[in-house]
Amino acid sequence: QNASRGRRQRRMHPNVSQGCQGGCATCSDYNGCLSCKPRLFFALERIGMKQIGVCLSSCPSGYYGTRYPDINKCTKCKADCDTCFNKNFCTKCKSGFYLHLGKCLDNCPEGLEANNHTMECVSIVHCEVSEWNPWSPCTKKGKTCGFKRGTETRVREIIQHPSAKGNLCPPTNETRKCTVQRKKCQKGERGKKGRERKRKKPNKGESKEAIPDSKSLESSKEIPEQRENKQQQKKRKVQDKQKSVSVSTVH
């Protein structure tokens, strides 16, 4: 305030504007621009202890251009806002605030969460998973022959990973026990994995029993045909109904 004492603005007429710089329409030695040429924005620029008027084609960061008939100026964004479109619509908030619908908030509203990278309030994203893929072939120690009881597995993909406050993903792998008619491995089949075998229709009489397993086994493979008599088929249908519980494991 002391700096202003004794330094006075002469009451001047706008047509006394000799020596005006750049976009000034009227000016004074002490104050710089007093008014601007059309379409330019008036702004106060600090030079040391002094503020002088300048005329700009666009406003600096932290300001937005206000236009009234024949008089434009750079107007400050709100205190919590770094860049704004107008007084009521912020486009980037100051540190510690989150942007939501043009406003800067300390905390995000209900149903939204803070993204600390973009510093915006964003919708909570819940996990989304695909449908289950078909069960893998019934295998034991990687083989699809030479055993009676084995395991089979199925998987599903994560389509949408959850955000911080979103619902966690459900299990993406399921494994269960399975039983097939014991079949000797043919010559050259020993050690072959299910995925190397020729795809065939699954056996109608196959029995499944769920077991917990954290291994991710081969997916989408079918079980080779097995010959069974009608009595065996009936027996297996009853077993299927009794053993339908499935235990899931997450990977």
Partner: antibody
Framework: EVQLVESGPGLVKPSETLSLTCTVS????????WNWIRQPPGKGLEWIGY???????YQNPSLKSRITISRDTSKNQFSLKLSSVTAADTAVYYC?????????????WGQGTLVTVSS | DIQMTQSPSSLSASVGDRVTITCKAS??????LSWFQQKPGKAPKTLIY???RLVDGVPSRFSGSGSGTDYTLTISSLQPEDFATYYC?????????FGQGTKVEIK
């Protein structure tokens, strides 16, 4: 020295239109911004609106629907019309000018004219 | 619209006193503030603009300060001719609004 002088009837009937003129000397109204301001008796100041050097106008939104500001450059005058007046429009009406954000606002004022709204 | 709250609404002081009048804006007005003096039956007279710049012919006992939302007019040593009503005005955006006024009376 810039001088502004308001003129117009001192008494206006309710629902009629108040009309005032400001005559400017010492400067051209084709420079700067020419304003109307009013002050009800014993109360504070209220800005009404302006007409710019090019003839464009801006009015206080609280009065906008009733205000017309115009000018006559040949006479170096600008005018205020306020329609549908009521007793609440009784005030001293001033004209005043400024030249831009970097200079003094309302550096020059008219002496004011009292307008009474009464039947 | 930006509201300007001026205080006090009136004050009693003696010649030679230091007088302070404040104006608070409802939002940051970025130094676009003027102070006016009005005597009974007269038009207001501009004292200060852009927060702290004295208009030509205004005595240096008048000074202005402030930033953001808070602004002050100070009369360092009150003189007999200073007894009047003082108004602040913001011109950061339209519509322009004045404070309600502060009447400075003789104690």
């Amino acid at each position: 020295e810039v001088q502004l002088v308001e003129s117009g009837p001192g008494l206006v009937k309710p629902s009629e239109t108040l009309s005032l003129t400001c005559t400017v000397s010492g400067d051209s109204i084709t420079s700067g911004y020419w304003n109307w301001i009013r002050q009800p008796p014993g109360k504070g100041l209220e800005w009404i609106g302006y007409i710019s050097y090019s003839g464009k106008t801006y009015q206080n939104p609280s009065l906008k629907s009733r205000i017309t500001i115009s000018r006559d450059t040949s006479k170096n005058q600008f005018s205020l019309k306020l329609s549908s007046v009521t007793a609440a429009d009784t005030a001293v009406y001033y004209c005043a000018t400024y030249y831009g954000y970097g200079g003094p606002w309302f550096a020059y004022w008219g002496q004011g004219t009292l307008v009474t709204v009464s039947s | 619209d930006i509201q300007m709250t001026q205080s006090p609404s009136s004050l009693s002081a003696s010649v030679g006193d230091r007088v302070t009048i404040t104006c608070k804006a409802s939002q940051d007005i970025d130094s676009y503030l003027s102070w006016f003096q009005q005597k009974p039956g007269k038009a207001p007279k501009t004292l200060i603009y852009l927060t702290n710049r004295l208009v030509d012919g205004v005595p240096s006992r008048f000074s202005g300060s402030g930033s953001g939302t808070d602004y002050t007019l100070t009369i360092s040593s009150l003189q007999p001719e200073d007894f009047a009503t003082y108004y602040c005005l913001h011109y950061d955006e339209f519509p322009l609004t004045f404070g309600q006024g502060t009447k400075v009376e003789i104690k």
